[in-house]
């Protein structure tokens, strides 16, 4: 196993990303050397800058996209798979993943899912609670989905160390970032914290921990004291504006 | 309510290959990563491998790498481990379990590796 | 690899008894990335808590989880009849996940 880079009591492993893709074709092995990932998709990127980005499945875009076949709004189906913006209310959908923020797919439509809709004792509890009784009618298009409601607990927020599939689905000051092979509430970045930031899109590669983006009034900037150092080896840091 | 059953154990010879299953229902498996761990009798336990929700992303302890092979079929809702290459020392109780730290698991099936 | 030490293997106590059981890591988790497990004999594990100290769905109140950095503790507050069991952490905050070896948790 590789040795671990503890920086800012975060026990990160860095491998350079390889270049292109999304990082591990379907069913393959893939290495368990993590590195650390992207600022999730297309999310930081200008209309004029803007270049498709590759993914393999939801997890691997932002908050607001969903990874699909550019020419077909399903993501699973042959050929390459890019981030996609995501549906607003009363679009189709699929799968949940496709509808925006505070939207879940219910019968094959972007609906709201706020919780204003649901009488108390019914609001239907999010992924992260690790209750299973999904019977939605989206279910069973296989699919991934990015966001579960199920059964009829009051929705609670997950606290750090919590399985998420959005950030919505976390507590404040936490974001859902891939780890391993799932992905879990962990703490947004504060000022001074080691981030990630990726020149290259779609050079993310296979990144088994994922840290959080930095937090509000905060921007991933090179530190200062390492403008010296190679392209490879330079340190970005969450920085103020 | 959910459900995880395993099938596929059994015995067989050092070197030999099986396939285990891990049939889900009652929540929505592709929501879900995935994962094998296994208990050798008397024992405790070990993590085998995992799996993302798409199946795009596959992952293994040291002990199997290179012999063991986790998939699954979203459309079937089934998980599925490949074992080749067994050893004696593969024998334990295999059980497939919801998510990265595991909230649900299956009654685990028993696979022996002996001649 | 992170070694999850448990202690004491084993711990008799009667039941209402108050029990804590010990999980050491080697290093240092930095994240709440804990979980602890009960097994009953000849059954599968159940989740009891996850993060450190969030109890898992349908877990009784008696059961809390704590603890940061190298050292986390289950605490059962008043052992019932049906505690008895052996209590895994598994820890799932670097690579590869790996489990405590257990506590036994017997009836004196």
């Known amino acids: 196993t590789l040795n671990s880079v503890l920086i800012n009591s975060n026990a990160i492993k860095n491998l350079p990303p390889p270049l292109g893709g999304a990082g591990g074709q379907p069913g393959s092995a893939v290495s368990v050397a993590p590195g650390v990932l992207y600022e999730g998709g297309n999310k930081y990127q200008t209309l004029d800058n803007y270049q498709p980005y590759p993914c393999a499945e939801d997890e691997e875009c932002g908050s607001d996209e969903y990874c699909s076949s550019p020419s077909r709004g399903a993501a699973g189906v042959g050929g390459v798979q890019i981030c996609l913006a995501c549906r607003k209310r009363r679009k189709r959908c699929m799968r949940h993943a496709m509808c925006c923020p505070g939207n879940y797919c219910k019968n094959g439509i972007c609906m709201p899912s706020d919780h204003s809709h649901f009488p108390r004792g019914e609001i239907e509890e999010s992924i992260i609670e690790n209750l299973g009784n999904d019977h939605n009618a989206a279910a069973g298009d296989g699919y991934p989905r990015r966001t579960t409601l199920t059964s009829k607990i009051y929705h609670t927020k997950g606290q750090e160390g919590s399985v998420c599939l959005r950030s919505s689905d976390c507590a404040a000051g936490l974001c859902c970032a891939r780890h391993f092979w799932s992905k879990i509430c962990k703490p947004v970045l504060k000022e001074g914290q080691v981030c990630t930031k990726h020149k290259r899109k779609g050079s993310h590669g296979l990144e088994i921990f994922q840290r959080c983006y930095c937090g509000e009034g905060l921007a991933c900037r090179i530190q200062k004291d390492h403008h010296q150092a190679s392209n490879s080896s330079r340190l970005h840091t969450c920085q103020r504006h | 309510q959910v459900q995880l059953v395993e099938s596929g154990g059994g015995l067989v010879q050092p070197g030999g290959s099986l396939r285990l299953s891990c049939a889900a229902s009652?929540?929505?498996?592709?929501?879900?990563?995935m994962t094998w761990v296994r208990q050798a009798p008397g024992k405790g336990l070990e993590w085998v491998s995992g799996i993302s929700g798409s199946g795009s992303y596959t992952y293994y302890a040291d002990s199997v790498k290179g012999r063991f092979t986790i998939s699954r079929d979203n459309s079937k809702n089934t998980l599925y481990l490949q074992m080749n290459s067994l050893r004696a020392e593969d024998t334990a109780v295999y059980y497939c379990?919801?998510?990265?730290?595991?909230?649900?698991w299956g009654q685990g099936t028993l696979v022996t590796v002996s001649s | 690899d992170i070694v999850l030490t448990q202690s004491p293997a084993t711990l008799s106590l009667s039941p209402g008894e108050r029990a804590t059981l010990s999980c050491r890591a080697s290093?240092?988790?930095?994240?709440?990335?804990l979980a602890w497990y009960q097994q009953k004999p000849g059954q599968a594990p159940r989740l009891l808590i996850y993060g450190a100290s969030n109890r898992a769905t349908g877990v009784p109140a008696r059961f809390s989880g704590s603890g940061s950095g190298t050292d986390f503790t289950l605490t059962i507050s008043s052992l019932e009849p049906e505690d008895f069991a052996t209590y895994y952490c598994?820890?799932?905050?670097?690579?590869?996940?790996?489990f405590g070896q257990g506590t036994k948790v017997e009836i004196k």
């Open positions: 290093q240092n988790l930095f994240s709440p990335y």
């Open positions: 598994q820890q799932y905050g670097d690579e590869p996940i790996t």
């Open positions: 009652g929540f929505t498996f592709n929501n879900y990563g």
């Open positions: 379990a919801r998510t990265i730290y595991m909230d649900y």
